[in-house]
């Protein structure tokens, strides 16, 4: 199976966006890009800011196919990858080469996936085998997490209340949300 380096036991292979070849709008929305959602106590450092939303890390995109055994998605997909160091957004421009990356002297900051979205993927198989479908998860946005010097490297501390979110960073699913309020989410879930 392809992309072994990116797969764990949850088999989070990246789906094809054949139905929607453009990058999903939610990934281009400034409200979800380059910020940590929700409030909380900011870390103590020389550039301390009262607004957690000012903390930023880079969200990169790259393209690849989904494979599952001999089956492969018809088109390559664009996946969001959380990368780079975290720091106050005003010192951490998205445009590479514009300013210096901010380095905290005390706590260690990590850019990690914040929200995921799920998608059913149609995979085409050789030899006349019937198309198969898989459900996979995509990173929808990134956020900064803080690791203090007093904690083990594996224990990442959230800026705010993100840790209380459900598994995989998904919000609890509504049964009857208004269409208007969720139009963007509806339009790009696949």
């Amino acid at each position: 199976q392809g992309w072994q380096a990116f797969k764990n036991d949850a088999t989070e292979i990246i789906p094809e966006l054949g139905e929607y070849p453009e990058p999903p709008p939610e990934l281009e929305n400034n409200k979800t890009m380059n910020r940590a959602e929700n409030g909380g106590r900011p870390p103590h450092h020389p550039f301390e800011t009262k607004d957690v939303s000012e903390y930023s890390c880079r969200e990169l995109h790259f393209t690849r196919y989904v494979t599952d055994g001999p089956c492969r998605s018809a088109k390559p997909v664009t996946e969001l990858v959380c990368s780079g160091q975290c720091g106050p957004a005003r010192l951490l421009p998205n445009a590479i080469g514009r300013g210096k990356w901010w380095r905290p002297s005390g706590p260690d900051f990590r850019c990690i996936p914040d929200r995921y979205r799920a998608q059913r993927v149609q995979l085409l198989c050789p030899g006349g085998e019937a198309p198969r479908a898989r459900k996979v998860r995509l990173v929808a946005s990134c956020k900064c997490k803080r690791l203090t010097r007093f904690h083990n490297q594996s224990e990442l501390k959230d800026f705010g209340t993100e840790a209380a979110r459900p598994q995989k960073g998904r919000k609890p699913r509504p049964r009857a949300r208004s269409a208007k309020a969720n139009q963007a989410e509806l339009e790009n879930a696949y």
Epitope: A118, Q167, K168
Partner: antibody, heavy 118, light 107 residues
Framework: QVQLQQPGAELVKPGASVKLSCKAS????????MHWVKQRPGQGLEWIGM????????NYNEKFKSKATLTVDKSSSTAYMQLSSLTSEDSAVYYC???????????WGQGTLVTVSA | SIVMTQTPKFLLVSAGDRVTITCKAS??????VAWYQQKPGQSPKLLIY???NRCTGVPDRFTGSGYGTDFTFTISTVQAEDLAVYFC?????????FGGGTKLEIK
């Protein structure tokens, strides 16, 4: 509010075909897979297949591949399932359901009871 | 196809009791399991997704857990309105399959 509307019942003769409808409202119809699920009286749930309204691409449970044909009409935001060569085994309630984020079948129609009888 | 084996088939309990339903997948499905409640004469309703995430509006007495092949659905304190059939479903690969259902009856 997301709604999937299905007719209440269909009475059909053995050997005939029936085309079930599922009219969607309250969300962007073309953005989500639509699923069809069968439930025989007093029994469990069986997934028949799914269709993506945007592309028309579909995926079937092999068991129903020769029985069901899924289509959509984007202009009316309606999904259809045609069942052919009906027998008493096909008497069941048929539900349409959509994903709304692919986290499970979040929204279901009320179901159409298909009765196959001479 | 992935087979979901759900037990027990029937549960007769009193209001206030704790109820546990289990589902075993024939192969690993990660945490891609959903739980549904179907009340008499109604369509199924999604309660839990990703094995443990409760849908908005679903009372917190309903919980789910598990990963891989073994999954559990629990009602901590059964209430009269919980009379229904409960189904598990693997949401990992097609054909998406359901457990046989557990009929919960209240004494």
């Amino acid at each position: 509010q997301v709604q999937l509307q299905q007719p209440g019942a269909e009475l059909v003769k053995p050997g005939a075909s029936v085309k079930l409808s599922c009219k969607a409202s309250g969300y962007t119809f073309t953005s989500y897979w639509m699923h069809w699920v069968k439930q025989r009286p007093g029994q469990g749930l069986e997934w028949i297949g799914m269709i993506h309204p945007n592309s028309g691409s579909s995926n079937y449970n092999e068991k129903f591949k020769s029985k069901a044909t899924l289509t959509v009409d984007k202009s009316s935001s309606t999904a259809y399932m045609q069942l052919s060569s009906l027998t008493s085994e096909d008497s069941a309630v048929y539900y349409c359901a959509n994903d709304y984020d692919d986290e499970g079948f979040a929204y279901w129609g009320q179901g159409t009871l298909v009765t196959v009888s001479a | 196809s992935i087979v979901m084996t759900q037990t027990p088939k029937f549960l007769l309990v009193s209001a206030g009791d704790r109820v546990t339903i289990t589902c075993k997948a024939s192969q690993s499905v990660s945490n891609d399991v959903a739980w549904y409640q179907q009340k008499p004469g109604q369509s199924p309703k999604l309660l839990i997704y990703y094995a443990s995430n409760r849908c908005t509006g679903v009372p917190d007495r309903f919980t789910g857990s598990g990963y891989g092949t073994d999954f559990t659905f629990t009602i901590s304190t059964v209430q009269a309105e919980d009379l229904a059939v409960y189904f598990c479903q693997q949401d990992y690969s097609s054909p998406w399959t359901f457990g046989g259902g557990t009929k919960l009856e209240i004494k």
